[in-house]
């Protein structure tokens, strides 16, 4: 069969080889397409409801006034010339539609190095067959699932036209110390060959390099966290980062209902104050960072060091 590629909505003429150029003609077209369940026969004398889709012209050719998705399939003509010689023509018709130029929507203006970022979503509307979307960084193809690159794809089909809408969401983790203004673009490659790719306008987000956070230090006074009943313990959370982050306090893994402060004072220690304390620093551009945990315990008179102690109620400390 001869392969024919036709654009959706355009007319198509299929020649019936060996057919006399003018009536009377002995010929028959047979179609097996999305509009038929088996073979549909069309003859020159035809003329009827199928004319809107396909009709035999006076010269024996089959005319499709506006090719649609349902017209994909096999078209055969059997013709007999004046001398009784039979000729067969066989066509395999495939249809296509080029979408509009793809676009990048919801694009990020800034990316953060070292963490996953959504770059944007590439959208292509009105293709057939579906085709594919691919991303490029500085003109080179980006390979999903490699070097911090991930792509989420979605394909939808219009219920009436049958045309496809493709969406591709790009996530990247920019390397620290890399290009501060990378260029991303997206391209649509048609499902049928011999058609060039369509590329979006590029986007150039800035890459922000976060200053690495030094460890959050928790200093305990008295050292070791062991104190006699009625004594005072001072916990200080030290974070070198600028601007100063918010500091919250945890006891036994549970946040203490206190306003943010870098210093926690536990005056007149009682059994209810025993437990494990830590501080959490929250910076606007980072996730929360927790310090090491320290254990606060009560030394009964005559003992040499921290005891297990019993954990009492939730006595709250005061903040400096």
């Amino acid at each position: 069969a001869q392969n024919i590629t036709a654009r959706i909505g355009e007319p198509l003429v299929l020649k019936c080889k060996g057919a006399p150029k003018k009536p009377p003609q002995r010929l028959e077209w047979k179609l097996n397409t999305g509009r038929t369940e088996a073979w549909k026969v069309l003859s020159p004398q035809g003329g009827g409801p199928w004319d809107s889709v396909a009709r035999v012209l006076p010269n024996g050719s089959l005319f499709l006034p506006a090719v649609g998705i349902q017209d994909e399939g096999i078209f055969r003509c059997q013709a007999m010339n004046r001398n009784g010689k039979e000729t067969k023509s066989n066509y395999r018709v495939r249809v296509y539609q080029i979408p509009g130029k793809p676009e990048i929507v919801d694009s990020a203006s800034e990316l953060t190095a070292g963490v996953p970022n959504k770059v944007g979503t590439c959208v292509s509307e009105g293709s057939y067959p579906a085709g594919t979307l691919s991303w490029h960084l500085d003109g080179k193809p980006l390979v999903p699932n490699e070097k911090g690159v991930s792509v989420k794809e979605q394909t939808r089909r219009h219920p009436e036209t049958g045309l496809f809408t493709l969406q591709s969401e790009l996530m990247v983790t920019p390397a620290r110390g890399g290009d501060p203004r990378p260029t991303f673009s997206c391209s649509f490659s048609p499902g049928l060959p011999r058609h060039r790719a369509l590329r979006t306008a590029p986007i150039q987000p800035r890459v922000w390099e976060p200053v690495p956070l030094e460890e959050v230090q928790l200093v305990v006074e008295p050292e070791g966290g062991a104190v006699a009943p009625g004594g005072t313990v001072t916990l200080t959370c030290e974070v070198p980062a600028q601007p100063s982050p918010q500091i919250h306090w945890m006891k036994d893994g549970v946040p203490l209902p206190l306003p943010p402060s870098p210093v926690l004072i536990l005056p007149e220690i009682g059994p209810q104050d025993q437990g494990t304390y830590s501080c959490v620093a929250t910076h606007s551009s980072h996730g929360p960072q927790e310090s090491r945990a320290v254990s606060i315990s009560i030394i009964e008179p005559g003992e040499e060091g921290p005891t297990a102690g019993s954990v009492g109620g939730s006595g709250l400390g005061t903040l400096a």
Partner: antibody
């Protein structure tokens, strides 16, 4: 909303002529074939004529061929049926309907107009 | 010309009944059969298109099926508003041919 409104029916003598009109709205008229269907009193439905979207091709059953002519004016969103040499058996309610080809077949109908052929 | 033989020509049924109407085409018409409902003094309304597809706004108790050249309209549970006359139509070839109609009456 798709609307089809027929007009032009009435009483006519055998051998006489009548022109029916159908005003279409609510859709892109020139994208669709159009069809006339009739129904004699107490009887079933009978196809009368179809026309393609451009108006270049028309189709009729033998019962009305050479007597009836279907036409359209896409600029006016209007469909017509010119009926000549009318006979008593042409007495019916005439409906205009959208479609008539294999893509869309008679999905919307007008309310009908009555044609009575009698002396 | 294609003949569409519709049966029965009339039937009596009660609300809630399952009703089946058949049209047989005299030759292959593919999937190109519609079903219509008509009430007295009103225009026909398309129920099913291309043999099996439910038209917009038509209740799901109506369904269409095809086996070769036999086409069936089924009303799964007859409602009071379903008492009407039903027609099939082949539109694969000219002349377009309607079935003779089936009048569904209250038992």
């Amino acid at each position: 909303e798709v609307q089809l409104v027929e007009s032009g029916g009435g009483l006519v003598q055998p051998g006489g002529s009548l022109r029916l009109s159908c005003a279409a709205s609510g859709f892109t008229f020139n994208n669709y074939w159009m069809t006339w269907v009739r129904q004699a009193p107490g009887k079933g439905l009978e196809w009368v004529a179809s026309i393609d979207n451009s108006g270049d091709n028309t189709y009729y059953p033998d019962s009305v061929k050479d007597r009836f002519t279907i036409s359209r004016d896409n600029a006016k969103n209007s469909l017509y049926l010119q009926m000549n040499s009318l006979r008593a058996e042409d007495t019916a309610v005439y409906y205009c309907a959208r479609g008539g080809d294999i893509r869309v077949s008679l999905d919307f109908w007008g309310q009908g107009t009555l044609v009575t052929v009698s002396s | 010309d294609i003949q569409m033989t519709q049966s029965p020509s009339s039937l009596s049924a009660s609300v809630g009944d399952r009703v089946t109407i058949t049209c047989r085409a005299s030759q292959d018409v593919g999937i190109y059969v519609n079903w219509f409902q008509q009430k007295p003094g009103k225009a026909p309304r398309r129920l099913i298109y291309r043999a099996t597809n439910l038209a917009d706004g038509v209740p799901s108790r109506f369904s269409g099926s095809r086996s070769g050249t036999d086409f069936t309209l089924t009303i799964s549970s007859l409602q009071p508003e379903d008492f009407a006359t039903y027609y099939c139509l082949e539109f694969d070839e000219h002349p377009l041919t309607f079935g003779g109609g089936t009048k569904v009456e209250i038992k």
